[in-house]
Interface confidence: low
């Protein structure tokens, strides 16, 4: 069971990143699915290595004082959402903006029906060029 | 099937990074090989988690305006090269240069004879000290 | 065999990061253990994908000139410690400090009784908020 999906620009104002089965994507079988373009949902309980990479372009003066944060989150059936992993990068002083990349990855136990998704502080700063931003998992 | 190879400084002007089976490297068997010191080639079709880490040292004033970009690329038999993953980091203002590290990783389907390699915008900026820059894969 | 442990602030002055089995941690079985809160020790020989993520907050003026470096290290029975992976990030000019995240990961052969741990140049700069700093491995 494995998946690798590709970022997609979205007009939605939500902080949850959108993904698509496009380009050189992976969706090994129907035991993992991309739901609503925003979350990877697994049907089998087990240990999964889950990862995300987010490239963004921001400028210190044009952004809030808070850093750019990417969060890998989990929603299990009947449970509240929880943060699994986070990474933070202070905005660049480069103009008009400076690109930076964040990589998250870790091993987690997922229940049947559990979904994982990626949240960012400012989706408008995310880079969607080929290969820059992606999200995936693999069952151990 | 798994491999982990170590960066090697090169006098070549190519943007493709060079690697060696040295130090604490891994080459599990002959189903994955390091070819010409530049690409990992697999003999078996399947899903692979492929990763690369690149540490570099650059300075904004001494570099081009474009960010430092590391790309994980795929060459399949009879197909054109394609980018699987990219990461970008704006150059540091630190002098003489500021070190930064990039990590790339994702799950991809590889065909028999497929090769993966790593491209960077400026190989002269890459750090080759122990552990700083490496490249590998594992078959799921 | 898999583990994922969560960073823990420590009053110790050691450069070795401390970890705990808390929050959304993973410890698949007793073939991998967290020893002294600082190292993951495996009982079985084999290939492991080992990873660490470190988020830190530093300021160029308040820090040494040297970059922030995170090292993934190995101690095998009858061998000296050695560095497997390192990543470096130059300190931010943001005030009071600028957050940055480092991700390390690679495939390595471990012997029975081998331990892996994470070293940083300045543990006081490490961020211990939910999900920011973690460490784990999985057996291939």
């Amino acid at each position: 069971i494995a998946a690798h999906v590709i970022s997609e620009a979205s007009s939605k104002t939500t902080s949850v990143l959108q993904w698509a089965e496009k380009g050189y994507y992976t969706m090994s079988n129907n035991l993992v699915t991309l739901e609503n373009g925003k979350q990877l949902t697994v049907k089998r309980q087990g240990l999964y290595y889950i990862y995300a990479q987010v490239t963004f372009c921001s400028n210190r003066e044009a952004s809030s004082q808070a850093p750019f944060i990417a969060s890998l989150c989990l929603k299990s059936p009947g449970r509240f959402e929880r943060i699994l992993l986070r990474a933070a990068n202070t905005h660049s002083s480069a103009k008009p903006c400076g690109q930076q990349s964040i990589h998250l990855g870790g091993v987690f136990e997922l229940q049947p029906g559990a979904s994982v998704f990626v949240n960012v502080t400012d989706p408008s700063q995310v880079s969607h060029g080929t290969g820059f931003t992606s999200f995936g998992l693999l069952k151990l | 099937i798994a491999a982990h190879v170590i960066s090697e400084a090169s006098s070549k002007t190519t943007s493709v990074l060079q690697w060696a089976e040295k130090g604490y490297y891994t080459m599990s068997n002959n189903l994955v090989t390091l070819e010409n010191g530049k690409q990992l080639t697999v003999k078996r079709q399947g899903l692979y988690y492929i990763y690369a880490q690149v540490t570099f040292c650059s300075n904004r004033e001494a570099s081009s305006q474009a960010p430092f970009i590391a790309s994980l690329c795929l060459k399949s038999p009879g197909r054109f090269e394609r980018i699987l993953l990219r990461a970008a980091n704006t150059h540091s203002s630190a002098k003489p240069c500021g070190q930064q590290s990039i990590h790339l990783g994702g799950v991809f389907e590889l065909q028999p004879g497929a090769s993966v390699f790593v491209n960077v915008t400026d190989p002269s900026q890459v750090s080759h000290g122990t552990g700083f820059t490496s490249f590998g894969l594992l078959k799921l | 065999i898999a583990a994922h442990v969560i960073s823990e602030a420590s009053s110790k002055t050691t450069s070795v990061l401390q970890w705990a089995e808390k929050g959304y941690y993973t410890m698949s079985n007793n073939l991998v253990t967290l020893e002294n809160g600082k190292q993951l020790t495996v009982k079985r020989q084999g290939l492991y994908y080992i990873y660490a993520q470190v988020t830190f907050c530093s300021n160029r003026e308040a820090s040494s000139q040297a970059p922030f470096i995170a090292s993934l290290c190995l101690k095998s029975p009858g061998r000296f410690e050695r560095i497997l992976l390192r990543a470096a990030n130059t300190h931010s000019s943001a005030k009071p400090c600028g957050q940055q995240s480092i991700h390390l990961g690679g495939v390595f052969e471990l012997q029975p009784g081998a331990s892996v741990f994470v070293n940083v140049t300045d543990p006081s700069q490490v961020s211990h908020g939910t999900g920011f700093t973690s460490f784990g491995l999985l057996k291939l």
Partner: nanobody, 119 residues
């Protein structure tokens, strides 16, 4: 064929110094971590020091820390061990060692050079 040839051993008084050398051939020296191991009379092998491929990293046993210095000259394919403030307990046969390709264990050893510390 891999060859490791140690030299520089001998008899020295406590507090004295010696410099051991190890000439390597038959492999790409600069691609390997190298180490020194010793065996005292009637005892097992003890790791003394290890140096990384380019010499930027060095590790020492607690028993020799601050007294011994490992170094290498990749242009000469030679490994060194500078031993200062020698003690009687440093008496041993010192071996130069090259790691196995997987870097998990050391698979090649020299014939050793005897260091005797005695007044």
């Amino acid at each position: 064929e891999v060859q490791l040839l140690e030299s520089g051993g001998g008899l020295v008084q406590p507090g004295g110094s010696l410099r051991l050398s190890c000439a390597a051939s038959g492999f790409t020296f600069s691609n390997y971590e190298m180490g020194w191991v010793r065996q005292a009379p009637g005892k097992g092998l003890e790791w003394v020091s290890v140096i990384s491929e380019v010499g930027s990293l060095t590790y020492y046993a607690d028993s020799v820390k601050g007294r011994f210095t490992i170094s290498r000259d990749n242009s000469k394919n030679t490994l060194y061990l500078q031993m200062n403030s020698l003690r009687a307990e440093d008496t041993a046969v010192y071996y130069c060692a090259k790691p196995h390709d997987s870097s998990i264990g050391f698979d090649y050893w020299g014939q050793g050079t005897l260091v005797t510390v005695s007044s």
